[in-house]
């Protein structure tokens, strides 16, 4: 599933065609089944408020390049999801760009309310990547990338939970650059601070910087993993965590490796190679398929390192759901 | 646009075979293809489909009995150990689905008899 | 799994007459992925309707289908001797997968 999104071609960057990332890769989406859900959830992700319509693609100039493919054959939300990748999706098998799916938001300049209060990542794909804002005495500052580092990064990622940051040689776009007073510059963190407010840093607005130099962050999703409907932690159906959505995994090329890597990273010992029928003692899922054809060498610490189709693309039902037991 | 198969022949059971379709006038990079077989005097059965990315999808009772792989201008059907009932015409095809564009081969017989 | 039913195994018509041949499906249908095929013997399918009612290239518009959920219609009004064939519902369902009906045998009397 898409690791980024964004509106292309719009006389704001709030209506657009669709792109979405997948593997550092900008694609389009196919329209088939593209509705007003699937907007609504995408301006929510964009912090772009609320839905206006479902345009085609193709009114948007300059439009997509050949060369661009067509990356989801459809996406199906339910409305109330925070993100497209949350969204049930298909990988694309009969699509053209003259079927781009395009999207217009009411409010170019809302902005999601970002949890915790005090700082946001605006301007991005979803809350766990972009321009760094913090609030002071009710106002949004944009923070200058003089001495900021990798750790102030670490300080952010954490606060708003989204996992470990990334090293990104990232700039903020044109587009995306910040219209509000510039907070602060010489952030000095340790890296081990609760919020970025307890880093050090320069006095409160006076610095020399402009939004060339407005900091840009990027957070990896959490991944974790859980077995679950088993009399212990160590056995069950398995469940993988991703854009804060727990789901379940398909059986299709599942063994041994994949097992074992499992059990090593829930701290679970061996498996203990259970039989099909074991496996199936825990019942199907619900919800989410996240991952299918998983492959391991079993070297791997965690199933996140292991080959896979992209997020949520499978050709399964919850009857071949994965289930583990590991030794404990 | 054009889709043609090849490789059907007589097998006896349990020899692994391998189908080619080869395409011209339209580009695997952006368009799935897939596999549908037919049965002398039966209905048509979709067995898989693969996706421009490589990867594949499966009917349900096709998993493990068949395997779809590509290159970037043939698709290729694996059929890992054959039984009689696998005695069809085997097409090749993209489906056209949402877009109506659908192109389908001639089809190539198996045959799998002792 | 998705099981694509046609009722009737064959039908009959007579030449200028109207034919309906249905299909039902055991679940809802993917963003409308129903389509009609045609098969003459010794030939591949040929596609009819794709989207429910969409008429496909070159497709006389004699052929109409219609329907909703999980019910679908296909309908040819002034048929023809050439229309003499076997017709197939197909459906597709989330995950790209596709089904194909049993398919119904149009005779023309």
């Known amino acids: 599933s898409p690791s980024g999104v964004r509106l292309v071609g719009g006389l704001h960057r709030c209506e657009g065609r669709v792109e979405v990332e997948q593997k550092g890769q900008w694609g389009t989406v196919c329209d088939d089944g593209w509705d007003i859900k699937d907007v609504a959830v995408l301006c929510r992700e964009l912090g772009c408020g609320a839905a206006s319509g479902t345009p085609s693609g193709i009114l948007y100039e300059p439009p997509a390049e050949k060369e661009q493919k067509v990356l989801i054959q459809s996406v199906s939300c339910t409305g109330t999801e925070d993100t497209l990748a949350q969204c049930e999706q298909e990988e694309v098998y009969d699509c053209s760009h003259d079927e781009d799916a395009g999207a217009s938001c009411e409010n170019p300049e809302s902005s999601f309310s970002p949890v915790p209060e005090g700082v946001r990542l605006a301007d991005g794909p979803g809350h766990c990547k972009g321009r760094v804002e913090v609030k002071h005495q009710n106002q949004w500052y944009t923070v200058c990338q003089t001495g900021w580092s990798l750790r102030a990064a670490k300080v952010v990622c954490r606060q708003l939970g989204c996992g470990r940051a990334v090293l990104t040689q990232k700039r903020c776009n044109k587009h995306a650059y910040g219209r509000k007073p510039i907070w602060l510059s010489q952030m000095s963190c340790s890296g081990r601070e609760a919020t970025l407010q307890d880093c050090p840093s320069g006095p409160w607005g006076k610095n020399t910087c402009n939004h060339d130099e407005d900091t840009w962050v990027e957070c990896e999703d959490p991944f974790d993993l859980r077995l679950v409907g088993g009399d212990n932690l160590c056995s069950g159906r398995l469940e993988v965590l991703h854009k804060g959505v727990w789901g379940s995994v398909c059986d299709d090329n599942w063994g041994e490796k994949e097992d074992q890597v499992v059990c090593k990273q829930l701290g679970c010992g061996k498996s203990l190679s259970p039989s099909f029928r074991d496996r199936k003692c825990y019942g199907p899922g619900v919800g989410r398929i996240w991952l299918d054809n998983v492959r391991c060498s079993g070297e791997e610490q965690s199933l996140e390192q292991c080959q896979h189709r992209f997020w949520g693309f499978h050709d399964c039902t919850h009857q071949e759901d994965v289930a583990v037991i590991c030794s404990g | 646009q054009s889709v043609k198969e090849s490789g059907g022949r007589l097998v006896t059971p349990g020899t692994p075979l391998t189908l080619t379709c080869t395409v011209s006038?339209?580009?695997?990079?952006?368009?799935?293809m897939s596999w549908v077989r037919q049965a002398p005097g039966k209905g048509l059965e979709w067995i898989g489909l693969?996706?421009?990315?490589?990867s594949a999808s499966y009917a349900s009772w096709a998993k493990g009995r068949f395997t779809v792989s590509r290159t970037s201008t043939t698709v290729d059907l694996n059929l890992t150990s054959p039984t009689t009932e696998d005695t069809a015409t085997y097409f090749c095809?993209?489906?056209?689905?949402?877009?109506?564009?659908?192109?389908w081969g001639q089809g190539t017989l198996v045959t799998v008899s002792s | 799994e998705l099981v694509m039913t046609q009722t009737a195994s064959s039908v009959s018509a007579a030449v200028g007459g109207t034919v309906t041949i249905s299909c039902q499906s055991s679940?809802?249908?993917?963003?409308?992925?129903w389509s009609w095929y045609q098969q003459k013997p010794g030939q591949p399918p040929k596609l009819l309707i794709y989207?429910?009612?969409t008429l496909a290239s070159g497709v006389p518009s004699r052929f109409k289908g219609s329907g909703s959920g999980t019910q679908f219609t296909l309908t040819i009004s002034g048929v023809q001797c050439d229309d003499a064939a076997t017709y197939y519902c197909?459906?597709?369902?989330?995950?790209?997968?596709?089904?194909f009906g049993g398919g119904t045998e149009l005779e023309i009397k």
């Open positions: 095809a993209h489906v056209g689905a949402t877009t109506g564009r659908d192109f």
């Open positions: 006038g339209f580009s695997l990079s952006s368009s799935g």
């Open positions: 693969t996706f421009p990315s490589g």
């Open positions: 679940q809802n249908i993917y963003n409308n992925r």
């Open positions: 989207q429910a009612s």
């Open positions: 197909a459906g597709g369902y989330s995950g790209t997968i596709f089904t």
